[in-house]
Interface confidence: low
């Protein structure tokens, strides 16, 4: 009977960590000589298994090749890794007496595709916080997957975003691949509670994509709106000033009261009010004894937010000498307001 080496599968796909069988059958046991499995072709081909009774980690024969009539030379590879990818050839040799064994026929080859899962996507953003209306880039990276075909999508609050660029490397054939994608997001003041999600779908994930998440709270700065107001006096000798910092993020806030440019009080906010959009409010009260101030005084509320330049709001209160009516009060618009002490 004519010898034919048959590898019925042109390719097999196996998940990393699983096992796979590479089938090889012969139509004849003649001529006498060994069967060997190789990965690759040519001088650099790698001997994988030779049915010589040797112990090879992770590889064993499927059938009992010591049986005289055995024609099945299939092997099982266990705990497959991406490095096992390649084309495997079942090769029949004719035994030499003095000279080396001679290769007489090879199977058509079975390509092993290792299905390796992508790593959990890692989303990175800008090193510095951005402000509303600023465009910032986020990058998503995942690596170690095979085969090469993969889908990556970006979402912000459920809406799909179009990436600036997505690349899968290397472009040629490899045991495993990496993907990198960049998306541009326009920040807005409502984004403190928002998330940017990178979603990766791959054959190995069984329709359950992996997600990487960037909380925009880590990448946005919303500067406060600062207002200074004067409350109705509680007594004839007391003025109540209020400095209100509204809708800011992150929490880092320092508030200083100045009288005519001199620091009067440092206020370290402790109990911030949180808004539903994730931003914060803070109100600082400054009680001033009017009897100590006969001249005009400029009160300044200075707010430093998240290491940014200070925001200042002035409030002028007229001294007693300017007042013709006890307790009368004038308020001026814009940042500067002028009031009577009593």
């Amino acid at each position: 009977k004519e010898l034919k080496v048959t590898q019925p599968e042109k390719s097999v796909s196996v998940a990393a960590g699983d096992s796979t069988v590479l089938n090889c059958t012969l139509t004849s046991l003649l001529p006498v000589g060994p069967i060997r499995w190789y990965r690759g072709v040519g001088p650099s081909r790698l001997l994988i298994y030779s049915f010589a009774g040797e112990y090879v980690p992770r590889i064993r024969n499927v059938s009992d090749t010591t049986k005289r009539n055995n024609m099945d030379f299939s092997i099982r590879i266990s705990n497959v890794t991406p490095a096992d990818a390649g084309i495997y050839y079942c090769v029949k040799f004719q035994k030499g007496s003095s000279e080396p064994d001679t290769e007489i026929q090879s199977g058509g080859g079975t390509e092993v595709y290792v299905l390796a899962k992508p790593s959990p996507p890692e989303v990175s953003g800008p090193a510095d916080r951005g402000i509303p209306d600023q465009k910032v880039n986020f990058t998503c990276k995942s690596h170690g997957f095979s085969p090469r075909n993969i889908t990556l999508k970006w979402f912000k609050d459920g809406q799909e975003l179009h990436p600036l660029e997505t690349t899968v490397n290397p472009s040629g054939k490899n045991v495993s691949y990496n993907i990198s994608s960049t998306v541009r997001v326009v920040l807005n003041s409502m984004d403190v509670n928002s998330k940017v999600i990178c979603e990766v779908a791959h054959i190995t994930l069984d329709r359950s994509p992996l997600r990487g998440i960037a909380n925009l709270s880590n990448f946005i700065r919303v500067s406060p709106t600062v207002k200074v107001t004067q409350q109705s006096p509680t007594s004839m000798n007391q003025v109540n000033l209020t400095c209100r910092a509204e809708r800011f993020y992150p929490e880092d806030l320092q508030l200083i009261w100045l009288e005519n440019g001199n620091v009067s009080r440092n206020d370290t906010p402790k109990n911030l009010t949180k808004n539903t959009d994730g931003t914060y409010n803070y109100t600082s009260l400054f009680l001033v004894n009017s009897s100590a101030h006969r001249e005009d005084v400029v009160f300044t509320c200075q707010v430093k937010h998240d290491q940014q330049p200070a925001i200042t709001r002035n409030h002028t209160v007229l001294g007693f000498a300017h007042s013709s009516d006890q307790g009368s009060m004038q308020t001026f618009p814009d940042n500067n307001a002028t009031h009577n002490w009593n």
Partner: antibody, heavy 119, light 107 residues
């Protein structure tokens, strides 16, 4: 033995969307290990690869057509589909679907369906 | 995109002749090349995959060789039923691209 059969309208008006379906028989589209591709051939011309889909979702398109092409798969019906929007007379061609192993070529083809774009 | 340049674009040969078609890739594609036969009014048929492997059921007079950028397809003894157009196709890089085709006729 896997067989493929294209179906869809033979005549499409300019600016409309061309829609074709490829039905797979003799095997499961979701068995894995294959690309399911669309190829077209303009009258008297060569072959042009449109794109391919893997059953689980990843899709590749020819960049020259990407803005107008959508390929999708319906594993429950064992079918995959092609949509080509904003067609012109230049999209008149025979459209083929094929099964393609990772490294074993497009070994199974549909018989092809002729699509004419004309008003 | 990888450009596949096939030559000649057409040829005429006698029954029994040896016919050779070449395909040149614009970049190294290793052995990621297939050859197809297309008869008039029919779908293409895979003949050779991975540059040199003959598809099951394909007559042994068809063969392929080459690697890198230069590939050859050979019909060792042309038969009347071989009248067709032959295409090479690379799949090393997306998008997959085909050669322009070689039309083979009988003298």
């Amino acid at each position: 033995q896997v067989q493929l059969q294209e179906s869809g309208p033979g005549l499409v008006k300019p600016s409309q969307t061309l829609s074709l379906t490829c039905t797979v028989s003799g095997g499961s589209i979701s068995s894995g290990g294959y690309y399911w591709s669309w190829i077209r051939q303009h009258p008297g011309k060569g072959l042009e690869w449109i794109g391919a889909i893997y059953y689980s979702g990843p899709i590749y398109y020819n960049p020259s057509l990407k803005s107008r092409v959508t390929i999708s798969v319906d594993t429950s019906k064992n079918q995959f589909s092609l949509k080509l929007s904003s067609v012109t007379a230049a999209d008149t061609a025979v459209y083929y679907c094929s099964k393609e192993g990772y490294h074993s070529g497009m070994d199974v083809w549909g018989q092809g369906t002729t699509v004419t774009v004309s008003s | 995109d990888i450009q596949m340049t096939q030559s000649p674009s057409s040829l005429s040969a006698s029954v029994g002749d040896r016919v050779t078609i070449t395909c040149q890739a614009s970049d190294d594609i290793s052995d990621y090349l297939n050859w197809y036969q297309q008869k008039p009014g029919k779908a293409p048929k895979l003949l050779i995959y991975d540059a040199s492997n003959i598809e099951d059921g394909v007559p042994s007079r068809f063969s392929g060789s080459g690697s890198g950028t230069d590939f050859t397809f050979t019909i060792s003894s042309l038969q009347p039923e071989d009248i067709a157009t032959y295409y090479c196709q690379q799949f090393a890089y997306l998008p997959w691209t085909f050669g322009g085709g070689t039309k083979v006729e009988i003298k």
